[in-house]
């Protein structure tokens, strides 16, 4: 299980995974753009088993999901940090 923790730099991801996570195992996804003291984009997945995984933003599977989310929310203004509940 990959760790997520808070530091004074406000980057939370120590390690990142590129492995596909099925939707039925996901509770929510948080996408934090670079900034606020962290120089990189971070994607954090909260799983239903209560574990947390940092996902490599370049991972193909998460890019495909983010593209799908972008299409779904194209009519709403972008937000700097948001959480998506996965149905």
């Amino acid at each position: 299980v990959l760790e997520v923790y808070y530091t004074h730099l406000r980057c939370r991801c120590v390690q990142e995974s590129s492995v596909f996570i099925p939707r039925r195992f996901i509770d929510r996804i948080q996408i934090s753009p670079r900034g606020n003291g962290c120089p990189r984009k971070e994607i954090i997945v909260w799983k239903k088993n209560k574990s947390v995984v940092c996902v490599d933003p370049q991972a193909e599977w998460i890019q495909r999901i983010m593209e799908m989310l972008r299409k779904k929310s194209s009519s709403t203004p972008p937000v700097p940090v948001f959480k998506r509940k996965i149905p």
Epitope: V19, P22, R23, F25, W61
Partner: antibody, heavy 120, light 107 residues
Framework: EVQLVESGGGLVQPGGSLRLSCAAS????????MSWVRQAPGKGLEWVAE????????NYAPSLKDRFTISRDNAKNSLYLQMNSLRAEDTAVYYC?????????????WGQGTTVTVSS | DIQMTQSPSSLSASVGDRVTITCKAS??????VAWYQQKPGKAPKLLIY???YRYTGVPSRFSGSGSGTDFTFTISSLQPEDIATYYC?????????FGGGTKLEIK
């Protein structure tokens, strides 16, 4: 060493019932999703059902959900499959498998299988 | 349900050959595909997960690729111990589904 050991298979008449068991050792059974997968003689693999650790989420192959019931007892490290109204086409080797949801998300450990024969 | 169409259903190759098996999903499964090896009378073994990641202890001659609907499994140099039936599986959504299998034989 992780071990999944199925039992309860055997010969049963059409219309009969059977309860399969899968005993797990070497893993923290109560943390993992588990699945049943079957394989008819000379055929491919067919997923039957899965259950989450708390037994709050259960999914079935649509064609089997009316006759088969998956359950588990975490205190006994055991997975079960209750099969009712059995038909000749249910004849198969039945495997239990761990459905990992921490690292791999696929079925990473399998039992050796138990054979169910439905015949008159 | 998502259908997984695997081809070929059987394949004969020589030791040292490069072997390729394909699997086509009836709808987008992202990278939620695994590949399993099954030898006669034995349980399946996980080889590849998330379309392209080798499971622990799996030799480097086994590889996988693909995303969306088209997936490929490759054995770069066939060994005698690789004789088995290989299955793709989608675990993107339930019901989980397997391909029909590819029986691999040595020429």
């Amino acid at each position: 060493e992780v071990q999944l050991v199925e039992s309860g298979g055997g010969l049963v008449q059409p219309g009969g019932s059977l309860r399969l068991s899968c005993a797990a050792s070497g893993i923290d059974f109560s943390r993992y999703w588990m699945s049943w997968v079957r394989q008819a003689p000379g055929k491919g693999l067919e997923w039957v059902a899965e259950i989450n650790p708390e037994s709050s989420t259960i999914n079935y192959a649509p064609s089997l959900k009316d006759r088969f019931t998956i359950s588990r007892d975490n205190a006994k490290n055991s997975l079960y499959l209750q099969m009712n109204s059995l038909r000749a086409e249910d004849t198969a080797v039945y495997y239990c498998a761990r459905q990992d949801d921490y690292e791999y998300y696929a079925m990473d450990y399998w039992g050796q299988g138990t054979t169910v024969t439905v015949s008159s | 349900d998502i259908q997984m169409t695997q081809s070929p259903s059987s394949l004969s190759a020589s030791v040292g050959d490069r072997v390729t098996i394909t699997c086509k999903a009836s709808q987008d499964v992202n990278t939620g595909v695994a590949w399993y090896q099954q030898k006669p009378g034995k349980a399946p073994k996980l080889l590849i997960y998330s379309a392209s990641y080798r499971y622990t202890g799996v030799p480097s001659r086994f590889s996988g690729s693909g995303s969306g609907t088209d997936f490929t499994f490759t054995i770069s140099s066939l060994q005698p111990e690789d004789i088995a039936t290989y299955y793709c599986q989608q675990y993107y959504s339930t019901p989980l589904t397997f391909g029909g299998g590819t029986k691999l034989e040595i020429k």
